[in-house]
Amino acid sequence: EEELQVIQPDKSVLVAAGETATLRCTATSLIPVGPIQWFRGAGPGRELIYNQKEGHFPRVTTVSDLTKRNNMDFSIRISNITPADAGTYYCVKFRKGSPDDVEFKSGAGTELSVRAKPSAPVVSGPAARATPQHTVSFTCESHGFSPRDITLKWFKNGNELSDFQTNVDPVGESVSYSIHSTAKVVLTREDVHSQVICEVAHVTLQGDPLRGTANLSETIRVPPTLEVTQQPVRAENQVNVTCQVRKFYPQRLQLTWLENGNVSRTETASTVTENKDGTYNWMSWLLVNVSAHRDDVKLTCQVEHDGQPAVSKSHDLKVSAHPKEQGSNTAAENTGSNERNIY
């Protein structure tokens, strides 16, 4: 009679993570008598997957009943496959021995490849805000996918970006992989409503890529432009001076009026108007009683935006051009400014 051969008909098997893998194995003879064992890998580091004779293998079931006398089918099923299960599996026949069974013949091996989906890409931007014309970096990370081949693209408002660097780790063989990409984006004043998108395509996603997004509103700081103007005289001795704070983002803004360098009033931007591009406008006004001044008045609108160093704009008020009211010592009325907006 011909010597027993162990047949593993499938050179490779591809299974999606979470599914059950079937590893086929048959023997060509019932002799010699002895159990079958399944291993992953070869050499001294090989791992025991199933032992017909003894042991507890909760994820492994046999395809046929191995207790039947004439059984020659030693195929197994491994449930709930993960990327960690990838490798070459060997079906090995042992010959009954005393005191221990002896390895008799091995199958050629079946390579189990596991397809695992990448995790949802996570996009993160810089820790601190940056102003237009500056270049900022965004990172995108996705983990746990297999096989290694993967495509990553970056977009800003639907336009593909080209300035990025991507690494897939580890470089060598692994049960699963991670991708890490860094893209450089130049900010513009119109980017408050902009989005940066990282798109990951993988064989497991059936052409429906995963996307991670970051809103540039979390990253950008658009500094305000200031304009101080003098409005027509309200009453004989009162002048209305307005400070228009335009096109700023985010909203966090504090404004201080100074008269000849002395603080007159401080207020926080509250009722702002929003521009189409997502930036804000605000106006503050100061009613100056010119009759209280003998000399010209230097009015300064000082704005501290989003914790940045203050910027200011000044306006010289010519007192000589106005009649002076005797006995008045009030220089400015601290009238609220948020009731009126020019936009």
Epitope: G43, P44, G45, E47, L48, G97, P99, D100, V102
Partner: antibody
Framework: EVQFQQSGTVLARPGTSVKMSCKAS????????MHWVKQGPGQGLQWIGA????????TYNQKFKGKAELTVVTSTSTAYMEVSSLTNEDSAVYYC???????????????WGQGTLVTVSA | DIQMTQSPSSLSASLGERVSLTCRAS??????LNWLQQEPDGTIKRLIY???SLDSGVPKRFSGSRSGSDYSLTISGLESEDFVDYYC?????????FGGGTKLEIN
């Protein structure tokens, strides 16, 4: 009780070969991989390779391929290692140890031979 | 190949003292790490297998642990026979590799 008895000290000339032995007793020889480890004078340990007595399957550390050759005689439960083209660098103590026929944590390198000292000198 | 970086290479300590030796793995080896003891006459004995399992007959003052890629052997209450050489060994991936060794000397 499991024991490994290694052959005695060897003094050899450069360019020649030496063959040392490791006789196992106290368990089933064919259920284990036999490993060899080198320790140079005042140095650490280096894994050379291993052999599986059932089918003479061998695995080597790339650094020792062509330098060491592993064999077994199953009938006498003895593992052999031949080190060829000897140089001063081969002067060392060589140990045999074992691991189970698959990767069983408790069975990795439990038992060790006493070592064979090889001195290479002209 | 997986590199096992063992530290310190030598250590002076006193009887009764508690000491820790560390091995850092350059790649993931899971729990597949042994600690070996080598006597001055060359005799090698395994103390710990699978990172933290104590071999039978090994005194309870020896213990093994892991933190990330760092593996430690701790001897609590040194005795005179402990002042020998110690090696870690990874058996996760071939070629199997050893740490450079630690020589434990009496103060």
């Amino acid at each position: 009780e499991v024991q490994f008895q290694q052959s005695g000290t060897v003094l050899a000339r450069p360019g020649t070969s030496v063959k040392m032995s490791c006789k196992a007793s106290g368990s089933t020889f064919t259920s284990y991989w036999m490993h060899w480890v080198k320790q140079g004078p005042g140095q650490g340990l280096q894994w050379i390779g291993a052999i599986y007595p059932v089918n003479n399957d061998t695995t080597y550390n790339q650094k020792f391929k062509g330098k060491a050759e592993l064999t077994v005689v199953t009938s006498t439960s003895t593992a052999y290692m031949e080190v060829s083209s000897l140089t001063n660098e081969d002067s060392a103590v060589y140990y045999c140890t074992r691991s189970f026929y698959y990767s069983l944590d408790a069975a990795w390198f439990v038992y060790w031979g006493q070592g064979t000292l090889v001195t290479v000198s002209a | 190949d997986i590199q096992m970086t063992q530290s310190p290479s030598s250590l002076s300590a006193s009887l009764g003292e508690r000491v820790s030796l560390t091995c850092r793995a350059s790649q993931d080896i899971g729990s597949r790490l042994n600690w070996l003891q080598q006597e001055p006459d060359g005799t090698i004995k395994r103390l710990i297998y699978a990172t933290s399992s104590l071999d039978s007959g090994v005194p309870k003052r020896f213990s093994g642990s892991r933190s990330g890629s760092d593996y430690s052997l701790t001897i609590s209450g040194l005795e005179s026979e402990d002042f020998v050489d110690y090696y870690c060994l990874q058996y996760a991936s071939s070629p199997f590799t050893f740490g450079g060794g630690t020589k434990l000397e009496i103060n």
